[in-house]
């Protein structure tokens, strides 16, 4: 015998106080998948976190961080402090990268500056505490003669992969 | 959605060279440092260097300091590791992997691996 | 910088699985933890202590304080019968990305 929960769709439950009727999830509820015997409770964005898509009776709503705040954990369970470029978050709080790292984002720790003599290549820009050492081309190439090399440019803010 | 597809095993000699390609699709390659990593049979992950798709900038572990070179071709969103001056203890799979978007995560997306021998 | 983790932790299905990464002030520093199966790229399933990337099941969980990292496996299927490494990244040194060596999960 087929289950008659079964031909509930989503955004409805299979009401065993109404002879296991389709009934429509109640408000701030939603079920995703059909046959379900309850309706989940819709998430809600409050404090630190915003809402980034209403919750429908369908899908449940998704947050983001406001600003000042980034994202972490598998659909945004957890909002941690921005810092400024130039800086890293500690457990103690923000602090300025060390000498010989720099960050170029508003999260993540400090990354050390690019050894441009590993790959025999000079400095042509300096590191700092926002931006990494620009190389330029190997001192071989700086001999009279040898032709113009265009420094490459400096890295844009990556993207963030979705967690 | 996001892929790094590394190039065929190799065997090698020692005292040869190997280079492994990782082709990324699925996002902006130059907008993500890619990872190099390699384990050896019966042994850990180990962790080999770093390239900085966009600007090619690079930093790598002491120990390989002088024997690789991580490069990048931006036009076919490809990174390559070259490991000159092979021995028998080179004999690993290699891995590309790719940084998040920011230092100090996790690897989230990996190659399948690229089993590199160095027999004579 | 040194992450020691045990060779091997034994669990009986449907039990808790803790597999410990010991550092010099590692609760100082972000962890992040993998999965790796036999002839399988390594998986990320835990990051930043006690993160779990899209995917990942509840029942993986993670700490970081003092001197230990732990990863916690909850409820333990044959499934996650596998090696679990531990990894920092550490910039005052000339090696910065760390692993630990490797534990190995078994599922009795």
């Known amino acids: 015998l087929q289950d008659p929960c079964s031909n509930c769709p989503a955004g409805t439950f299979c009401d065993n106080n109404r002879n296991q009727i389709c009934s429509p999830c109640p408000p701030n509820s939603f079920s995703s998948a059909g046959g379900q015997r309850t309706c989940d409770i819709c998430r809600q964005c409050k404090g630190v976190f915003r809402t980034r898509k209403e919750c429908s009776s369908t899908s449940n709503a998704e947050c983001d961080c406001t600003p000042g705040f980034h994202c972490l954990g598998a659909g945004c369970s957890m909002c941690e402090q921005d810092c400024k470029q130039g800086q890293e978050l500690t457990k103690k709080g923000c602090k300025d990268c060390c000498f010989g790292t720099f960050n170029d984002q508003k999260r993540g720790i400090c990354r050390p500056w690019t050894n441009c003599s590993l790959d025999g290549k000079s400095v042509l820009v300096n590191g700092t505490k926002e931006r990494d050492v620009v190389c330029g081309p190997s001192p071989a190439d700086l001999s009279p003669g040898a032709s113009s090399v265009t420094p490459p440019a400096p890295a844009r803010e990556p993207g963030h992969s979705p967690q | 959605q996001v892929q790094l597809v590394q190039s065929g095993a190799e065997v090698k000699k020692p005292g040869a060279s190997v280079k492994v390609s990782c082709k990324a699709s699925g996002y902006t390659f130059t907008g993500y440092y890619m990872h190099w990593v390699r384990q050896a049979p019966g042994q850990g992950l180990e962790w080999m260097g770093w390239i900085n798709p966009n600007s090619g900038g690079t930093n790598y572990a002491q120990k390989f300091q002088g024997r690789v070179t991580m490069t990048r071709d931006t036009s076919i969103s490809t990174a390559y590791m070259e490991l000159s001056r092979l021995r028998s203890d080179d004999t690993a799979v290699y891995y590309c992997?790719?940084?998040?978007?920011?230092?100090?995560?996790?690897?989230?997306?990996w190659g399948q691996g690229t089993l590199v021998t160095v027999s004579s | 910088y040194v992450l020691t983790q045990p060779p091997s932790v034994s669990v009986a299905p449907g039990e808790t699985a803790r597999i410990t990464c010991g550092g010099d002030?590692?609760?100082?520093?972000?962890v992040h933890w993998y999965q790796k199966k036999p002839d399988q790229a390594p998986v990320l399933v835990v990051y930043?202590?006690?993160y779990r990337p899209s995917g990942i099941p509840e029942r993986i969980s993670g700490s970081n304080s003092g001197n230990t990292a732990t990863l916690t496996l909850s409820r333990v299927e044959a499934g996650d019968e596998a090696d679990y490494y531990c990894q920092v990244w550490d910039s005052s040194s000339d090696h910065p990305g760390v692993f630990g060596g490797g534990t190995q999960l078994i599922i009795l």
């Open positions: 992997a790719r940084e998040p978007g920011y230092y100090g995560s996790g690897l989230d997306y």
């Open positions: 930043e202590d006690r």
């Open positions: 002030d590692i609760g100082d520093k972000r």
